[in-house]
């Protein structure tokens, strides 16, 4: 004969555990029903009556089968630098992520605790690694033959144009200026031409540092919580 199906609450066999979606109540010493996601235990079970469940109140939730006496509070409303990517419901917590142009500087178990704006690279520097949801932009000095004349969190170093006759040679923060009317664009080996986003504003080229305040040339600030990479800097 098939074993009789036990209905909760029931006393488990010695050495056995309660079934899926059940829990062992120490006081009643019985296997009792868990409450479904979106509910909590309003009344715990006894030897003769099963768990009584009730729906979570507004702004509270339970995500798992449970026997908690109170639902968990949803996190506070998303701050102005965040967007709500998951709403607070009876079955799930609110999740806030950083808005475009920002990244998560201090994370928490779900979502982000503190967002920060993506830093921008100055003229003479291009984006080495773009910012992500969880990491800041990394800048790199423009190599000889390339330049960036913008303050941007997306612009890479671009090749100088090649002139038939050079009026003003290019540098790290300025393109070459040609005297001829039809310059040809340089395509250095490996150079990639991406569509360049419009800069936020016209930018003065960075002045040459005065020796008394010029930084040393061995430090590239890191992105996120990773160690710094090596690279040269200008002031």
């Amino acid at each position: 004969l098939p074993a009789q199906v036990a209905f909760t609450p029931y006393a488990p066999e010695p050495g056995s555990t309660c079934r899926l979606r059940e829990y062992y109540d120490q006081t009643a010493q019985m296997c009792c029903s868990k409450c479904s996601p979106g509910q909590h235990a309003k009344v715990f079970c006894t030897k003769t009556s099963d768990t009584v469940c009730d729906s979570c109140e507004d702004s509270t939730y339970t995500q798992l089968w449970n026997w908690v006496p109170e639902c968990l509070s949803c996190g506070s409303r998303c701050s102005s630098d965040q967007v709500e990517t998951q709403a607070c419901t009876r079955e799930q917590n609110r999740i806030c992520t950083c808005r475009p142009g920002w990244y998560c500087a201090l994370s928490k178990q779900e979502g982000c605790r503190l967002c920060a704006p993506l830093r921008k690279c100055r003229p003479g520097f291009g984006v080495a690694r773009p910012g992500t949801e969880t990491s800041d932009v990394v800048c790199k000095p423009c190599a000889p033959g390339t330049f960036s004349n913008t303050t941007s969190s997306t612009d890479i170093c671009r090749p100088h144009q090649i002139c038939n006759v050079v009026a003003i040679p290019g540098n790290a923060s300025m393109d070459a200026v040609c005297t001829s009317t039809s310059p040809t664009r340089s395509m250095a080996p490996g150079a990639v031409h991406l569509p360049q986003p419009v800069s936020t504003r016209s930018q003065h080229t960075q002045p040459t540092p005065e020796p008394s305040t010029a930084p040393s040339t061995s430090f590239l600030l890191p992105m996120g919580p990773s160690p710094p990479a090596e690279g040269s800097t200008g002031d």
Epitope: C115, C121, F125, H204, Q206, T213, G231
Partner: antibody, heavy 123, light 110 residues
Framework: EVQLVESGGGLVQPGGSLRLSCAAS????????MGWVRQAPGKGLEWVGF???????YYANWAKGRFTISRDNSKNTLYLQMNSLRAEDTAVYYC?????????????????WGQGTLVTVSS | DIQMTQSPSTLSASVGDRVTITCQAT??????LAWYQQKPGKAPKLLIY???TLESGVPSRFSGSGSGTEFTLTISSLQPDDFATYYC????????????FGGGTKVEIK
């Protein structure tokens, strides 16, 4: 010579306003992120805020709503407008230039400082 | 909100001593840390940025180390000119911040 010179400090009554100026010579202020740091008598350094080279402003929590950082590129001058002043705002206020390390438009790390101007808030 | 805590607040030492000052951040700031020196009545002077990179013109007896939440400033052989107050500063984040500087460490003559 590259230097920053603050002015505009003095005695002001609680609830009053004051505007500090920082005049730069030898550098083009518009190319740099510039900030303010203050120091109460006998106390440590306290970050006030800065304006990035791209024009974005960042403030300490306590300064938001009362203090405003701006600049006039044509005058090569940085400003700190302080409103609703309190006794605890009494301090030497320093203007400082961001080092721009790592090629960033701001790092909040200052490698050039002015001599400071004293603001006293008292009745 | 990231807070910076320096220790000790005061340090008595003699010329020639090796001096160590520590700075602790409440959250990981990677290597976004600077050290400044300040003498009475003067503006602060940047010594180290990026936790360990010496600013131009700063004597090599100064060195910095650490990453994440624990940082150290070391003066290998204290000179008469080094008696001053030293501050650490985080440069990692500027949103929701009360102060970016540590409380300071005064290095005085023993």
């Amino acid at each position: 010579e590259v230097q920053l010179v603050e002015s505009g400090g003095g005695l002001v009554q609680p609830g009053g306003s004051l505007r500090l100026s920082c005049a730069a010579s030898g550098i083009d202020l518009s190319s740099y992120t510039m900030g303010w740091v203050r120091q109460a008598p006998g106390k440590g350094l306290e970050w006030v805020g800065f304006i990035s080279s791209s024009g974005h402003t960042y403030y300490a929590n306590w300064a938001k709503g009362r203090f405003t950082i701006s600049r006039d590129n044509s005058k090569n001058t940085l400003y700190l407008q302080m409103n609703s002043l309190r006794a605890e705002d009494t301090a030497v206020y320093y203007c400082a230039r961001d080092g721009g390390y790592g090629g960033y438009d701001y790092t909040g790390i200052f490698n050039l400082w002015g001599q400071g101007t004293l603001v006293t808030v008292s009745s | 909100d990231i807070q910076m805590t320096q220790s000790p607040s005061t340090l008595s030492a003699s010329v020639g001593d090796r001096v160590t000052i520590t700075c602790q951040a409440t959250e990981s700031i990677s290597s976004w840390l600077a050290w400044y020196q300040q003498k009475p009545g003067k503006a602060p002077k940047l010594l180290i940025y990026g936790a360990s990179t010496l600013e131009s013109g700063v004597p090599s007896r100064f060195s910095g180390s650490g990453s994440g939440t624990e940082f150290t400033l070391t003066i290998s052989s204290l000179q008469p000119d080094d008696f001053a107050t030293y501050y650490c500063q985080q440069g990692y984040i500027y949103t929701n911040v009360d102060n970016t500087f540590g409380g300071g460490t005064k290095v005085e003559i023993k």
